[in-house]
């Protein structure tokens, strides 16, 4: 099949890192610097991505693969293949159109990116607040208030072990 294909299309013999030059009797010409072809049989090379400004190069372009970018310190990647860089904020903040703003009371953000999220409502699970929330940390829910009534133990004692061969009475 490969031999048949190459008889039909001479370009199929051109390896990655080259392009098939229609204007030169379909000669395989190397991709120029700062361009690449990641598969064989290509009629063009792709221009390499350039990591400029807030982007920095994570992986250099080669004749067979594109460059990969990430973001300079103080920024983080967004989008497929790090198509955008977004400013970091501190924990306890979120990025708004006016810059980094502290989380409102009742919300938190434990990362340098993303939005402030509401504290967990422990009572929805029938639990109580064990540790209060902050701008940087969610609340920690503890046992339900009923479990903490005087004389009640929050630790369940182990069930007595049965002896083998005895059925329950």
């Amino acid at each position: 099949f490969e031999r048949t294909r190459s008889l039909q299309d001479p370009c199929s013999n051109c390896p990655a890192g080259t392009f098939c030059d229609n204007n030169r009797n379909q000669i395989c010409s190397p991709c120029p610097p700062n361009s690449f072809s990641s598969a064989g049989g290509q009629r063009t090379c792709d221009i390499c991505r350039q990591c400029k400004g807030v982007f920095r190069t994570r992986k250099e372009c080669s004749s067979t693969s594109n460059a990969e970018c990430d973001c300079t310190p103080g920024f983080h990647c967004l989008g497929a293949g790090c198509s955008m860089c977004e400013q970091d904020c501190k924990q306890g903040q979120e990025l708004t159109k006016k810059g980094c703003k502290d989380c409102c009371f009742g919300t938190f953000n434990d990362q340098k990116r993303g939005i402030c999220r509401p504290w967990t409502n422990c009572s929805l699970d029938g639990k109580s607040v064990l540790v209060n929330g902050t701008k940087e940390r969610d609340v920690v829910c503890g046992p339900s208030p009923a479990d903490l009534s005087p004389g009640a133990s929050s630790v369940t004692p182990p069930a007595p072990a049965r002896e083998p061969g005895h059925s329950p009475q």
Epitope: F19, N23, P33, N34, T44
Partner: nanobody
């Protein structure tokens, strides 16, 4: 919005020379291959050549008469045309693409074109 503006066209006698310019506004040429195409009245668009990263690729009609170069400082690409013939009469378009060469490619952006007429 990217705008490509061609200039330098005009009337020239056979055997003469012209240098066409292509200037980009709204974006630099830094990360694009730059190509030239031409279209004569009643004919299909024809590939002239592509420039990228110090390398130029040309269509098979010009046989060394045309040269593409680039001035990064001026953000301009040039098409030097020597020994012009009547059959070179056409509208010449500048275009940019993320592909090299642009012989088989639909460009990402293309200018409005500049008329070149070769006649005695």
């Amino acid at each position: 919005e990217v705008q490509l503006v061609e200039s330098g066209g005009g009337l020239v006698q056979p055997g003469g020379s012209l240098r066409l310019s292509c200037a980009a506004s709204g974006r630099t040429f830094d990360n694009y291959a730059v190509g030239w195409f031409r279209q004569a009245p009643g004919k299909e668009r024809e590939y002239v050549g592509t420039y990228w990263s110090g390398y130029a690729h040309y269509g098979d009609f010009e046989k060394g008469r045309f040269t593409i170069s680039r001035d990064n400082a001026k953000n301009t690409v040039y098409l030097q045309m020597n020994n012009l013939r009547p059959e070179d009469t056409a509208v010449y378009y500048c275009a940019i693409s993320l592909k090299y060469p642009m012989a088989t490619v639909t460009p990402d952006y293309q200018g409005q074109g500049t008329q070149v007429t070769v006649s005695s």
